[in-house]
């Protein structure tokens, strides 16, 4: 007799989730010698332990602590890149600028990037049919709590000048409800972080507005300043050119610095 299964509004666990986490862990520890000591089987066991057999609307940050402990990693000062609503460009940037790191360049972020997962109360099964949706079902679901947990930790450990890439094409360039706005901003440590530098990425080729004057950026500046962290903002008018210049800084068209405008 098939057992009754809770139907959630979100898509189910990503196909071959356990194998993907394990394979990603092996690959990551291969190319990051500082994480070579990590036992990927233990990482998977800790990941699994955070959500298996638990009601998927009652997951806590505490559930992920064993995993967080295993994945402890530090980023050098001035090398943290946060992002909001512009993941692809942020990742393209760190693929070129290899000494800067987004959360998804760290082990735990890399393991979970673009994946969905959840279990069921009192069974050892993974639910491949459906998982809770943040809006329609609950916010304390395995995926949302994971990202909140690791984002908090990522922000807490940042130091020096922290950079954030923001999407200038959105109606809210800075969104207080995003992970950046609700978690990371509030967990930067003023005693370790001297400044937050926002890079506002323009969408249109002919867009020459100073988006650093946007009301939501002013709101971000206010929040950051109140936390005794200095704030800077730059317009990135041509993201394609910006990436090209990161790849080839010696290019004559890059030396003039025309691809962004600086605002304090």
């Amino acid at each position: 007799v098939p057992r009754w299964r809770q139907q959630w509004s979100g898509s189910g666990t990503t196909s071959r989730f356990p194998e993907t986490v394990l394979a990603r862990c092996v690959k990551y520890t291969e190319v990051h010698p500082e994480m070579r000591h990590v036992d990927c089987q233990s990482v998977w066991d800790a990941f699994k332990g955070a959500f298996i057999s638990k009601y998927p609307c009652n997951i806590t940050e505490e559930d992920y602590q064993p995993l967080v402990k295993l994945g402890t990693q530090t980023v050098p000062c001035n090398k943290t890149l946060l992002w909001s609503r512009i993941k692809d460009l942020a990742h393209q940037f760190t693929q070129v600028q290899r000494d800067m790191f987004t959360l998804e360049d760290m082990l735990l972020g890399y393991l979970a990037d673009d994946l969905t997962w959840c279990g069921e109360f009192n069974t050892f099964e993974i639910n491949y049919q459906s998982c809770p949706d943040w809006r329609k079902d609950c916010s304390n679901n395995p995926v949302s709590v994971f990202w909140k947990t690791v984002s908090r930790r990522f922000a807490e450990t940042a130091c020096g000048v922290v950079h954030v890439m923001l999407n200038g094409s959105r109606s809210k360039i800075f969104d207080k409800n995003s992970t950046f706005g609700s978690v990371e901003v509030h967990n930067l440590q003023p005693e370790k972080v001297q400044a937050l530098e926002a890079w506002v990425i323009h969408g249109g080729r002919e867009d020459s507005r100073d988006l650093c004057q946007d009301p939501t950026i002013k709101e971000l500046e206010s929040i950051i300043s109140k936390r005794n962290i200095r704030f800077f903002c730059k317009n990135i008018y041509r993201p394609d050119k910006f990436l090209q210049c990161v790849k080839n800084p010696e290019d004559s068209s890059c030396l003039s610095g025309i691809h962004h405008h600086h605002h304090h």
Partner: antibody
Framework: QVQLVQSGAEVKKPGSSVKVSCKAS????????ITWVRQAPGQGLEWMGS????????EYAQKFQGRVTITADESTSTAYMELSSLRSEDTAVYYC??????????????WGQGTLVTVSS | EIVMTQSPATLSVSPGERATLSCRAS??????LAWYQQKPGQAPRLLIY???TRATGIPARFSGSGSGTEFTLTISSLQSEDFAVYYC?????????FGQGTKVEIK
């Protein structure tokens, strides 16, 4: 018992490409790390790159970047190594090998029998 | 990348004698070192991993030692089937690198 069986010897012209296959039998192919290592006549071993079939997204040694393409087909449990713009110095035996399944250290416990690629005009 | 240097290039030993092969890393590789044996026309065969652990089916006459930058493979009493080329490989820092090999030949 896991085995890696490679395709046969190839003779190629300079400037052309070669594609060597490596078929795995036994075990869970998707989670192996399949690696390619080459050995020029009378020379030592040289690591070229590796792939985890489930993920795709191979890693390459700097020396071969841009010239080598490593792929894997999970449906046939076969990994491939394609080397382009061949020159005489690429004449070598090409081996596929794997790490201990699936999350052991990065030494090679199982090897294919090797494929001799001769580049000659 | 880490450079692995093996010495000597060739070692001439009589059957029954002891052979000592050396492998030096250009920087510390901890104990993340493997040894392989290769006979003519064959693929390499794993002998030792973790600097000192024998792989499955490898006779007790093969032993490995060392850590950091200096490693040794010892064959306590050479048998006729042991005459071959031996390679060390570090798997501490990506990309993985091999030594250039030591040929053990009959004296």
């Amino acid at each position: 018992q896991v085995q890696l069986v490679q395709s046969g010897a190839e003779v190629k012209k300079p400037g052309s490409s070669v594609k060597v296959s490596c078929k795995a039998s036994g075990g869970v192919f998707s989670l192996y790390t399949i690696t390619w290592v080459r050995q020029a006549p009378g020379q030592g071993l040289e690591w070229m790159g590796s792939i985890i079939p489930l993920l795709g997204d191979p890693e390459y040694a700097q020396k071969f970047q841009g010239r080598v393409t490593i792929t894997a087909d999970e449906s046939t449990s076969t990994a491939y190594m394609e080397l382009s713009s061949l020159r005489s110095e690429d004449t070598a035996v090409y081996y596929c090998a794997r790490y201990p399944y699936p999350y052991g250290s990065k030494y090679f416990d199982i090897w294919g029998q090797g494929t001799l690629v001769t580049v000659s005009s | 990348e880490i450079v692995m240097t093996q010495s000597p290039a060739t070692l001439s030993v009589s059957p029954g004698e002891r052979a000592t092969l050396s492998c030096r890393a250009s920087q510390s590789v901890s104990s993340n070192l493997a040894w392989y044996q290769q006979k003519p026309g064959q693929a390499p065969r794993l002998l030792i991993y973790g600097a000192s652990t024998r792989a499955t089916g490898i006779p007790a006459r093969f032993s490995g030692s060392g850590s950091g930058t200096e490693f040794t493979l010892t064959i306590s009493s050479l048998q006729s089937e042991d005459f071959a080329v031996y390679y060390c490989q570090q798997y501490n820092n990506w990309p993985w690198t091999f030594g250039q090999g030591t040929k053990v030949e009959i004296k």
